[in-house]
């Protein structure tokens, strides 16, 4: 079972119209450059076999991967949105730094690894796709962690 108190984000993080709008604008801008619409990174398959109480921990892993392997390397693109959205997501990541689950998380890591593998396999277009799904990342964090 997750240590719930640490796998939580305050609702106020998702009620800031300006940064929410910038996050969604960034996602839209990137999705215009994504021509592989059949592949979804964040969706039903990511959550398959993961209980509701474990989903915030799962999304923490996805958030950290997105920041470190996608947003930081692509930080010069999609301005001015990127320079505002990355610090916002980094703050959420920092607030989830103590979110862990007790016991076996292999099923979670397996799902996250599939997402990572898909991004890596697609190369730069995988990174663009991940940026294009920042609205889904935002919603998933909101749904799982508040």
């Amino acid at each position: 079972a997750p240590i719930s108190s640490h796998c939580r984000l305050d609702k106020s993080n998702f009620q800031q119209p300006y940064i929410t709008n910038r996050t969604f604008m960034l996602a839209k801008e990137a999705s215009l450059a994504d021509n592989n619409t059949d592949v979804r990174l964040i969706g039903e398959k990511l959550f398959h076999g993961v209980s509701m109480s474990e989903r915030c921990y799962l999304m923490k892993q996805v958030l950290n991967f997105t920041l470190e392997e996608v947003l930081f390397p692509q930080s010069d693109r999609f301005q001015p949105y990127m320079q505002e959205v990355v610090p916002f997501l980094a703050r959420l990541s920092n607030r989830l730094s103590t979110c862990h689950i007790e016991g076996d998380d292999l099923h979670i890591q397996r799902n996250v690894q599939k997402l990572k593998d898909t991004v890596k396999k697609l190369g730069e277009s995988g990174e663009i796709k991940a940026i294009g799904e920042l609205d889904l990342l935002f919603m998933s964090l909101r749904n799982a962690c508040i």
Epitope: F24, K28, R40, G43, K45, D135, M139
Partner: antibody, heavy 119, light 107 residues
Framework: QVQLVESGAEVKKPGASVKVSCKAS????????ISWVRQAPGQGLEWMGW????????NYAQKFQGRVTMTTDTSTSTAYMELRSLRSDDTAVYYC????????????WGQGTLVTVSS | DIQMTQSPSTLSASIGDRVTITCRAS??????LAWYQQKPGKAPKLLIY???SLASGAPSRFSGSGSGTDFTLTISSLQPDDFATYYC?????????FGGGTKLEIK
Amino acid sequence: QVQLVESGAEVKKPGASVKVSCKASGYTFTSYGISWVRQAPGQGLEWMGWISAYTGNTNYAQKFQGRVTMTTDTSTSTAYMELRSLRSDDTAVYYCARDRGYYDAFDIWGQGTLVTVSS
Amino acid sequence: DIQMTQSPSTLSASIGDRVTITCRASEGIYHWLAWYQQKPGKAPKLLIYKASSLASGAPSRFSGSGSGTDFTLTISSLQPDDFATYYCQQYSNYPLTFGGGTKLEIK
């Protein structure tokens, strides 16, 4: 090309059941789900529920809970919607639509199946 | 359930007109809104998703805007093929819900 093809029109008596099929082609069936939407004559669109072609998980509108069953057959890339205990106000065109089920609009629709419930 | 209120329910316009249809959600739905066009006897067709993204194959004269609770569909210059019924739909929360529709008629 990507398409959804539904079964033909049905005429049923009140109290009977109907099972409508929706055959998908042109895409990976298990990468998406199927929503079912109905439209009574001269009326608007009404969402009935969704089924995942990947897991078989379902999400039904409360109005249809206990009366509708949605299933898929991945071997034939076909989705099914069964509605039981039919009433005259179930007379409608029933559409299937492609839908990932996670913040996704309906980008591909079937042609619709007219179900008429009449004694 | 999230209620979707479309206005007007009927709209008369002429070829070449700029037309706007509005849709209001009973609670915030971010940008999870789609617009569909339906012609008599046919299945609906996706025009706009994520409030403002143009669907594949949809003419560029269609555009969408808005976020939160208030949304608009705009047709920049009405063509003969555009006379149809238009529906908005929210896909932020289950159950998914549609607006009541706007019938666009020839003036």
